[in-house]
Interface confidence: medium
Amino acid sequence: TQHGIRLPLRSGLGGAPLGLRLPRETDEEPEEPGRRGSFVEMVDNLRGKSGQGYYVEMTVGSPPQTLNILVDTGSSNFAVGAAPHPFLHRYYQRQLSSTYRDLRKGVYVPYTQGKWEGELGTDLVSIPHGPNVTVRANIAAITESDKFFINGSNWEGILGLAYAEIARPDDSLEPFFDSLVKQTHVPNLFSLQLCGAGFPLNQSEVLASVGGSMIIGGIDHSLYTGSLWYTPIRREWYYEVIIVRVEINGQDLKMDCKEYNYDKSIVDSGTTNLRLPKKVFEAAVKSIKAASSTEKFPDGFWLGEQLVCWQAGTTPWNIFPVISLYLMGEVTNQSFRITILPQQYLRPVEDVATSQDDCYKFAISQSSTGTVMGAVIMEGFYVVFDRARKRIGFAVSACHVHDEFRTAAVEGPFVTLDMEDCGYNIPQTDESTLMTGRA
């Protein structure tokens, strides 16, 4: 998937210092064998940079070649740079790996924003700050690309964590996580804690900082507060979910809930913004504008063209509303809500003209491919991708940026009827196209 514009990454505020977190084993859910134990080696294993994605260190081949790999729940290919490129400090050198096997097959992946193409093969792969296992996985060795790698981003490949249905060139190419689960005793589950900084970071700050955690095979209780609430994965392609209600500062948008999921709603770590279908976006902006009407902002701000800036340290967070998305619950007629703050949906950026102020981009944007719950949403929460039980869990992240008055929230249960009607049934055409233009 396209790496788009992403949020700044850092240990964040409001939680225990990241380096001091220890998982609590005592209150692991007892009915989930194999997910118990210490994940301390995986905590803080993500890094990243403003607008350029969260990445994890992986090794490929024998002897192991270390690469930084973008974590993307909106695609399903494991693809790495395998040829010199001006934006890559290093790349996968297949000829140096004694365990590389060529599949004698090419792969071509176009995005709205550029493309990559390469050659398919398999090799041994491991995650140093992950489970202590090595798996043979499919790898797309990227030999040619256009506007895919980002100058200074510090990652050399992409780890698509979604399902085989959207893998390229077709669904017969087993994604990495499927291979991992099949070949090892790692439970079919991973969880992500993405930590936004709340302000722009320069290159050295990024390299010295933490972007969050990807816990493979389990749930680390130190990464969240309160309870985990689960929503069903509607269909295993993207991580598709169903939104049943949207509120701005507690005011219902009062739209037919099908509109919220037109033509799908997905959870995607490879997209920065909260992206909303056109009608929903327009209603949400109207409501956010009304709620924040004590200050007037240029229309260009709401459309993503202009920044809004305040004197350093004076951002009036309190004038902006909270946004709640109600998700279908696991029990019939039961939903729960996740609530994000302006600290999540106002993305800190450097004004290219001046750096004296605190400047922000409105990180909610219009979509023609349905709702995308990108980093704007994920940075508020610890998100559990429970593939084994076909569900996604949300809890308040221990590292989300907030202030003394409000915090992100996950609350329930709420009674919501006819939630199944909220899902949109996509006409059966070719659905193998990757989602593109993922700001």
Epitope: K147, G300, Q306, G437
Partner: antibody, heavy 120, light 108 residues
Framework: QVQLVQSGAEVKKPGSSVKVSCKAS????????ISWVRQAPGQGLEWMGS????????NYAQKFQGRVTITADESTSTAYMELSSLRSEDTAVYYC?????????????WGQGTMVTVSS | EIVMTQSPATLSVSPGERATLSCRAS??????LAWYQQKPGQAPRLLIY???TRATGIPARFSGSGSGTEFTLTISSLQSEDFAVYYC??????????FGGGTKVEIK
């Protein structure tokens, strides 16, 4: 240094359409906005609409709504402006210009302009 | 839509003299205003944004002031290359991002 290079002059018949291209080079294309501005002979500047390529959605001035379509192809870093149902008063120089990355959304880089003549 | 009115339509000034151009908005645009310079046969060039900030490479003799509805572009000492048409543009409420009608600065 960002540059915007536009397609060449066009002569069109009334009632037909014209599609002008604007190719960006030397900088980021996707997350900036591309606006289209026209200038009739001896007249002032008139803003027609804009698009942020990465979002793919365009905004248009009411005057041109339904007659103009602004699109962008990120793979080639090119924006397009198509104007349909042309009439003689659409004879003008059409400019593309870039904005974004700042508080004010000013048009800081301009294309060289494309002369469109509508004549029977 | 917001209407931008520039005055005068034409300003005759001698080289070395000061030129003051005015731009009025039909409703408040805060400091969301830009000034552009256009010479015959050329594309416009950004001079001032945020009502008073000079764009990169613009000489110090150009200055902008004002906020709300009244704005001024001042050229402190006109050089021969400054004779051109100047446009203001509001960047507050849009679409459309309206331009003023322009002020032509000519040699007296």
């Amino acid at each position: 240094q960002v540059q915007l290079v536009q397609s060449g002059a066009e002569v069109k018949k009334p009632g037909s359409s014209v599609k002008v291209s604007c190719k960006a080079s030397g900088g980021t294309f996707s997350s900036y906005a591309i606006s289209w501005v026209r200038q009739a002979p001896g007249q002032g500047l008139e803003w027609m609409g804009s698009i942020i390529p990465i979002f793919g959605t365009a905004n248009y001035a009411q005057k041109f709504q339904g007659r103009v379509t602004i699109t962008a192809d990120e793979s080639t870093s090119t924006a397009y402006m198509e104007l349909s149902s042309l009439r003689s008063e659409d004879t003008a120089v059409y400019y593309c210009a870039r904005s974004g990355g700042t508080k004010y959304g000013m048009l800081d880089v301009w294309g060289q302009g494309t002369m469109v003549t509508v004549s029977s | 839509e917001i209407v931008m009115t520039q005055s005068p339509a034409t300003l005759s000034v001698s080289p070395g003299e000061r030129a003051t151009l005015s731009c009025r908005a039909s409703q408040s645009v805060g400091s969301n205003l830009a000034w552009y310079q256009q010479k015959p046969g050329q594309a416009p060039r950004l001079l001032i944004y945020g009502a008073s900030t000079r764009a990169t490479g613009i000489p110090a003799r150009f200055s902008g002031s004002g906020s709300g509805t009244e704005f001024t572009l001042t050229i402190s000492s006109l050089q021969s290359e400054d004779f051109a048409v100047y446009y203001c543009q509001q960047l507050y409420t849009w679409p459309p991002r309206t331009f003023g009608g322009g002020t032509k600065v000519e040699i007296k």
